[in-house]
Amino acid sequence: GSERTCCPVNWVEHERSCYWFSRSGKAWADADNYCRLEDAHLVVVTSWEEQKFVQHHIGPVNTWMGLHDQNGPWKWVDGTDYETGFKNWRPEQPDDWYGHGLGGGEDCAHFTDDGRWNDDVCQRPYRWVCETELDKASQEPPLL
């Protein structure tokens, strides 16, 4: 059938979702597209438990998540409600800082070295995490 019952090769299963952790860096939009081409999305963190799981796998490295405010309000890429949902920002963040000298503010969220979140320039080449839910229409594990 078309239901995914197990995670693709090189993905990690956790709480009925599959996660893929990059070991290289891309700008936020490129990371977002990368995940979409895997029939997935940048990780959406909905609980403290999921936060701890992702944090354990990425280590102390800046890593993109599926949260941005490029069109105004903060939005999760899968439509999860931001206002009522889980948040783990660093103190004083997000601050839409303009002082970096790269033009514009900071519209994309990432995990920092301690796991808490920061907003940053979307063009920075950070690692990223893709997530897809089990039991949704998708493909079998890749065979190479």
């Epitope: 891309k26 990368y34 979409r36 229409a137 998708s138 493909q139 065979l143």
Partner: antibody, heavy 121, light 108 residues
Framework: EVQLLESGGGLVQPGGSLRLSCAAS????????MSWIRQAPGRGLEWSSV????????YYADSVKGRFTISRDNSKNTLYLQMSSLRAEDTAVYYC??????????????WGQGTMVTVSS | DIQMTQSPSSLSASVGDRVTITCRAS??????LNWYQQKPGKAPELLIY???SLQSGVPSRFSGSGSGTDFILTISSLQPEDFATYYC??????????FGQGTKVEIK
């Protein structure tokens, strides 16, 4: 054996339409994003379009956006490219290619033999 | 979009020669750089991925190096079957892949 076999090319008048097909075998087709890449006579390679394994996500080069539609039928292990409003500059060999990726490794690892599309009056 | 520029556009060499082809990206692409070989009338074939990793089945006389914006494909000792056109390709800002214009390696 992993194989991609394109068909559907031919001569078409400017403004006309054509549908290319690519039959895949030897691998789990629905597990991979697939792409169309073209090469005008005597010219280099130009990426044209890509579709995710489920068909849920598609992307196009600016040169074909709004005129070409990539699709797939995973039950038939077949990739398609519907081309409309064709122009002389669309004349090329069209290759279908399998995308393989795992982070740094993001490549077109299997290519078909190509099918020629000629747009001329 | 990221532009890829190869040089030279063509070169003449003899069997046994060491050949180098360069590829420059219009912005940093880290190591997201692949090389393909295309023989006349045939489809391209993957040679090297991630700037320096050799694709399975490709002879060890092919090697790649570089990161950021500047990359090199080297053929340590040119063989008769290596006369072909070589393309670099960036996979940094997927899904907009771009190729270099190609380098044709001809027999001197």
């Amino acid at each position: 054996e992993v194989q991609l076999l394109e068909s559907g090319g031919g001569l078409v008048q400017p403004g006309g339409s054509l549908r290319l097909s690519c039959a895949a075998s030897g691998f789990t087709f629905r597990s991979y994003a697939m792409s169309w890449i073209r090469q005008a006579p005597g010219r280099g390679l130009e990426w044209s379009s890509v579709i995710s394994g489920s068909g849920g996500s598609t992307y196009y080069a600016d040169s074909v956006k709004g005129r070409f539609t990539i699709s797939r039928d995973n039950s038939k292990n077949t990739l398609y490219l519907q081309m409309s409003s064709l122009r002389a500059e669309d004349t090329a060999v069209y290759y279908c290619a399998k995308r393989y990726n795992s982070g740094w490794h993001d490549v077109f690892d299997i290519w078909g033999q190509g099918t020629m599309v000629t747009v001329s009056s | 979009d990221i532009q890829m520029t190869q040089s030279p556009s063509s070169l003449s060499a003899s069997v046994g020669d060491r050949v180098t082809i360069t590829c420059r990206a219009s912005q940093s692409i880290s190591r997201y750089l692949n090389w393909y070989q295309q023989k006349p009338g045939k489809a391209p074939e993957l040679l090297i991925y991630a700037a320096s990793s050799l694709q399975s089945g490709v002879p060890s006389r092919f090697s790649g190096s570089g990161s950021g914006t500047d990359f090199i494909l080297t053929i340590s000792s040119l063989q008769p079957e290596d006369f072909a056109t070589y393309y670099c390709q960036q996979s940094y800002n997927t899904p907009t892949w771009t190729f270099g214009q190609g380098t044709k390696v001809e027999i001197k």
